[in-house]
Amino acid sequence: QAGPLPKPTLWAEPGSVISWGNSVTIWCQGTLEAREYRLDKEESPAPWDRQNPLEPKNKARFSIPSMTEDYAGRYRCYYRSPVGWSQPSDPLELVMTGAYSKPTLSALPSPLVTSGKSVTLLCQSRSPMDTFLLIKERAAHPLLHLRSEHGAQQHQAEFPMSPVTSVHGGTYRCFSSHGFSHYLLSHPSDPLELIVSGSLEDPRPSPTRSVSTAAGPEDQPLMPTGSVPHSGLRRHWE
């Protein structure tokens, strides 16, 4: 008897991170024997959608004409062949940006930093959030992911870099998110250009392990101070 049917491949075009209102197509690719494709969304009644295969039957298209909060989440797909249903695909995480206003990203004490010194990137959100992501342009994954340890919502997260090397130079953006759905992100912050001067060709730096603070100094404008437990944010390197 043959083994289980191979799992299909699941992907999104133009990508898995989509701005609010933009269109996205989810593709599920199985085998030529497929008769039907099913897409399941985590925490939604299954199946989320069913589609007949497109010729030559080895894949199906699931269209989202306008991205909204309802579509953000974790998906898996299956196909049915004459011998039964396949194994589930690896999950696809569809993330929506534009769920909240853009945070602001600053470099302290300055975006111009000498190699070997320290710099802290500060991401501040308008409303309290519990997850902050720092992205470096042309990097494959989020550089840094800070999440509140106890769900305490905070207006800012600090990303310390020390010692700074030439590797740190480049363009950064940050996003903020709520714990109830990490598939919903804010608009990206305006870009911040970090310029490292006097750079030596240092080895790749290791991240600092200090934790961000929950609230800023007393004069921090329009952001509550002392109203949030100083639980800090847990640091995740990805």
Epitope: W20, S101, T104, L122, L184, G216, D219, P221, L222
Partner: antibody
């Protein structure tokens, strides 16, 4: 594209109340604060307060406290501002505006409220 | 409350010339937490809603022509239009967002000479 469309002009008598609406489209409604700003004829801009659609949280300028109420209907992506005990100095154009980071990146077209006996 | 004072109240400038509008706040708008100035500039044409031009004192909003520039820090800020165009005739407002209540300057009316 982001749009804030406000209700039409109102003429009210002193002591009455007025309720102005602001319907949002073109963005994720729940995640952005909506503020209201007053502009009397030929004068400058004055901040009234905000509402956060996601939670219904509000904050009002002390000057308007007790007379202003902001509400939200998430099902229609609409926010409302009600101003009570109207007096002649409430005659103004009232704008709703979307907050970016405490500044305002999109504005409604304005609603003229005239208070006259 | 933070009081915002603009000068001059009105200004007439020839087409192609530089226009400068000043805004002074009653307390510093510079945050020591992020080294940013919590100040925005808006343009309001007759019969229209205000339009965001500048935020963080010097960051130009997307779609705003580069002849508009914001500068200054602390309590003193400037909006400069490097080469005045006919469509720039409007009233300009500064706004502080350092603390509630949010407050605006009284406005500066810009006309063509």
């Amino acid at each position: 594209q982001v749009q804030l469309v406000q209700s039409g002009a109102e003429v009210k008598k002193p002591g009455a109340s007025v309720k102005v609406s602001c319907k949002a489209s073109g963005y994720s409604f729940s995640g952005f604060y909506i503020d209201w700003v007053k502009q009397p004829p030929g004068k400058g801009l004055e901040w009234i307060g905000y509402i956060f659609p996601s939670s219904g949280e509000t904050s009002y300028n002390q000057k308007f406290k007790g007379r202003v109420t902001m509400t939200v209907d998430k099902s229609t992506s609409t926010v409302y501002m009600e101003l009570s005990s109207l007096r002649s100095e409430d005659t103004a154009v009232y704008y709703c505006a979307r907050q970016a980071f405490y500044y305002f990146d999109y504005w409604g077209q304005g609603t003229t409220v005239t208070v006259s006996s | 409350d933070i009081v915002m004072t603009q000068s001059p109240d009105s200004l007439a400038v020839s087409l192609g010339e530089r226009a400068t509008i000043n805004c002074k706040s009653s307390q510093s708008l510079l945050s020591s937490s992020n080294q940013k100035n919590y100040l925005a500039w808006y343009q309001q044409k007759p019969g229209q809603a205000p339009r965001l031009l500048i935020y963080w004192a010097s960051t130009r909003e997307s779609g705003v022509p580069d002849r508009f520039a914001g500068s200054g820090s602390g309590t003193d800020f400037t909006l400069t239009i490097s080469s005045l165009q006919a469509e720039d005739v409007a009233v300009y407002y500064c706004q502080q967002y350092y603390s509630y209540p949010l407050t605006f300057g009284q406005g500066t009316k810009l006309e063509i000479k």
